[in-house]
């Protein structure tokens, strides 16, 4: 409680805010928790406290640890903890998960990527932006204040974006980088009550005894990326896996298709070596999402082999 994780790279500036807030007039004291040693406020120190901020200029791996801040309000001394981890710089391009800030989503209409934590620093424009370690170039990319704007966002724009800027402290410059993932979502997307395209309600499917048969359950759920949408088969109201007939299996994985821009899913039910008793079962195609569940029932009937003598 009242604890915050902060991280940075060695030889870069890192500024951490006390997880306990307070009015600007309140005194804030910082301590290194392991030793209870007070953090100096003099700016000549590499690590120093400045009110609600703890500054590492620059940070070193050995600075990692838990720092305690005490905000002295008129009534109580309120305590917070900053868990600081400083990592060695990676030699390769990949940014590990532990250095990533929260993922942001964008769309054609809204494609702002904010540079994480930048408000804590004394920086001047412009920001430098990189995607998957490549400097961003071209008229589609615009660095504006503390965020990046991407024009005409496409799905290929998804990836890891790094902002790089310079923090200035009393005339000295320190580099800072921060990375976050960007995902692209279809803003025009919408979600509907499931619409089952196949099979038709109460459809009778003709099958040949001894042969294999396939039944396809296909449903659409709206436009764009859908959450919690699924299609599945049931036998006599029971899940296929629970029914216990190895000859009857659902195709592993659901195929996603976009029909006229609609998001659709289908699931194939495979019946091997059709038997007489299979004709007595009720086959239910179920489509469900956040709006609800729709069910279409299918029954099998015997298809007579063609009599070549008649």
């Amino acid at each position: 409680k009242f604890s915050k994780q902060s991280w940075g790279l060695e030889n870069e500036a890192l500024i951490v805010r006390c997880p306990r807030q307070g009015k600007p007039s309140y005194t804030v004291d910082w301590y290194y928790s392991q030793t209870n040693k007070s953090i100096p406020t003099q700016e000549r120190n590499r690590v120093f406290a400045s009110g609600q901020l703890l500054k590492f200029l620059p940070a070193a791996v050995a600075d990692s640890g838990i720092y305690t801040c005490i905000v002295r309000s008129p009534t109580f001394n309120r305590t917070g903890y900053a868990n600081v981890t400083i990592y060695k710089k990676q030699s390769d391009c990949n940014v590990p998960d532990y250095l990533m800030y929260s993922t942001v989503s964008g769309s054609e209409k809204n494609s702002k990527i904010y540079c994480p934590t930048i408000d804590l620093y004394n920086w001047t424009a412009p920001l430098e932006w990189f995607k998957n370690c490549q400097a961003l170039q071209g008229s589609r990319y615009r660095a504006h204040k503390s965020f990046l704007v991407i024009d005409n966002v496409m799905t290929e724009d998804a990836g890891d974006y790094t902002c790089k800027f310079i923090h200035n402290e009393n005339g000295a410059n320190y580099s800072v980088t921060a990375t976050r993932s960007f995902t692209v979502k279809d803003e025009q997307g919408f979600s509907l009550f499931p619409v089952i395209g196949a099979p038709a309600q109460n459809e009778i499917k003709e099958v040949e005894i001894g042969k294999n048969a396939n039944l396809t359950c296909s449903a659409c759920f709206g436009k764009g990326t859908q959450f919690l949408a699924a299609v599945l088969w049931q036998l006599n109201g029971t899940k296929i896996t629970d029914f216990g007939e190895p000859r009857i299996q659902q195709e592993e994985g659901q195929n996603q298709s976009f029909s006229n821009g609609l998001a659709c899913l289908d699931m194939v039910l495979r019946i091997a070596d059709v038997k007489e008793e299979d004709l007595l079962l009720q086959y239910d195609c179920l489509a469900l999402n956040l709006h609800g569940l729709r069910r279409h029932t299918v029954r099998l009937s015997r298809k007579n082999p063609i009599d070549h003598h008649s």
Epitope: K1, R20, S25, P74, T75
Partner: antibody
Framework: QVQLVQSGAEVKKPGASVKVSCKAS????????LHWVRQAPGQGLEWMGT????????VYNQKFKARVTMTADKSTSTAYMELSSLRSEDTAVYYC??????????????WGQGTLVTVSS | EIVMTQSPATLSLSPGERATLSCSVS?????MHWYQQKPGQAPRRLIY???KLASGIPARFSGSGSGTDYTLTISSLEPEDAAVYYC?????????FGGGTKVEIK
Amino acid sequence: QVQLVQSGAEVKKPGASVKVSCKASGYTFTDYELHWVRQAPGQGLEWMGTIDPETGDTVYNQKFKARVTMTADKSTSTAYMELSSLRSEDTAVYYCTRAFYNDYDDAFAYWGQGTLVTVSS
Amino acid sequence: EIVMTQSPATLSLSPGERATLSCSVSSSVSYMHWYQQKPGQAPRRLIYDTSKLASGIPARFSGSGSGTDYTLTISSLEPEDAAVYYCQQWNSSPLTFGGGTKVEIK
């Protein structure tokens, strides 16, 4: 929504003690300090003190320090204010109250309905 | 402790008039809070941090001041503004309130 519900009115004799309760709901009880303010009939507001429900730490107004005890029960999200050695001038409405955002002490945004304590022989 | 003095004790004005309530402090404070209290009700936060309007409070209420002198202004009085108004400091313990200004609507 944030609610502070106080116990009912009390009539006490001089020298007795009174314990007023304040049940909090609609927020995490231990995240906010609770204060007690009283108001004598036709008079102004007077701050009695505050408790941090997380730690049980208290800060009292020096005027009441010898007679007041503030406690908090985390399991029921209830704060208590006990005032002992009651005298007639303790007749007042007692309020529990909470700031809007704890760390910024940005005024008492939420108030209980008040508990009238009457001290009479 | 910090002593808060409110003036005037009573203010009697007509609807539509401007009301100016003062709060004088015995030693300098950084912020001032203001409350409105109607008979039989708990106080209601009006202005916090000197000039910030609390949610749900009409824009005719405003606060200003610094150091030892603070003001609550009601730009155009409405009948429902009849109440007692209190200032409060949170600069040092004990927290203290002013004695209140009663606003009456003629």
